[in-house]
Amino acid sequence: ISCGSPPPILNGRISYYSTPIAVGTVIRYSCSGTFRLIGEKSLLCITKDKVDGTWDKPAPKCEYFNKYSSCPEPIVPGGYKIRGSTPYRHGDSVTFACKTNFSMNGNKSVWCQANNMWGPTRLPTCVSVFPLECPALPMIHNGHHTSENVGSIAPGLSVTYSCESGYLLVGEKIINCLSSGKWSAVPPTCEE
């Protein structure tokens, strides 16, 4: 079982390989000096049907380096960064993992593209392994709350309350969504 020639790349090169390309072979892409690699640089020859070989993902691309590009902080609700830090310049990558009791959909890594957007795929999502969700929490008088998403919230996520200036928060500042679908505490109040 073998794979066909790896997909070509413009303004870059492919690592050495011999033919036939055996299943298990890795080929690596790189870009010419003034270009930045966007996407996974390694492709693996696999077989899904034990008959034909296929490459496990699309080839990356080489973008002409844009020194003015910068990407915003990427947020994945229920997830956290395991690699990558600000500032995010053209070609920089960020890799995510999911919190406990969350599973990942999509690709764990994204790259800062010349258009100031993360790609070449969408940001991954972290989905709760529990079907239960906690209901949306109410806003409080003279205060605000921040949550990692809007509406009902998956177990493992939290909401943080704060009060307007001149008001004191009474109760729990951070309330966690439990795996039971219940909140860990009642909303606090803001008192003068």
């Epitope: 090169r13 690592s15 050495y16 890795v26 996974e40 390694s42």
Partner: antibody, heavy 119, light 106 residues
Framework: QVQLVQSGAEVKKPGSSVKVSCKAS????????ISWVRQAPGQGLEWMGR????????NYAQKFQGRVTITADKSTSTAYMELSSLRSEDTAVYYC????????????WGQGTLVTVSS | EIVMTQSPATLSVSPGERATLSCRAG??????LAWYQQKPGQAPRLLIY???TRATGIPARFSGSGSGTEFTLTISSLQSEDFAVYYC????????FGQGTKLEIK
Amino acid sequence: QVQLVQSGAEVKKPGSSVKVSCKASGGTFSSYAISWVRQAPGQGLEWMGRIIPILGIANYAQKFQGRVTITADKSTSTAYMELSSLRSEDTAVYYCAREDDSSGYYQDWGQGTLVTVSS
Amino acid sequence: EIVMTQSPATLSVSPGERATLSCRAGQSINSHLAWYQQKPGQAPRLLIYDASTRATGIPARFSGSGSGTEFTLTISSLQSEDFAVYYCQQYEYWYTFGQGTKLEIK
């Protein structure tokens, strides 16, 4: 960080086989490749082959083709290297090593297993 | 297979001085090169990958450079714990290691 713990030292007779294990803890066993690298006494490092557990695909260095078998048990997060038709020149420390996402380099190594081949 | 040649076989340097280790590939390997440190009785430890990127937790005194066929590992100011054997490894086409350079105290 992934920890790789290997089985203990072995003494073998020429012509026999040896099977060394490498148990991984931490990280997702299926998502990385495990290579086997050996080092004869006072010598350098020599790549023998590697397996990608999630695919069950093993590849071997030409020198060891036909004599080495690398397998993995996903249920126990353990990789195995079996070397047959042993000769005295196979006396070495055998290491398992992990590469992440087909990176090509080894972030984590086992502690090594000394295999002595002697009559 | 791609042959990796390291030089010198042994390098004697005084603590606090700079050490420069070389690695040559038998054909172009782009930047697909890693450096490892190995001390007696221990497994190798990853220092540098992609020719010039320091691995997590590796001190800034270690730096790598080069691409194509010529590569260098530089240790800017040698500490006592840096005396060891250093190996380069290519991953352009499967995997091969250099024969090693022993860095010893002068």
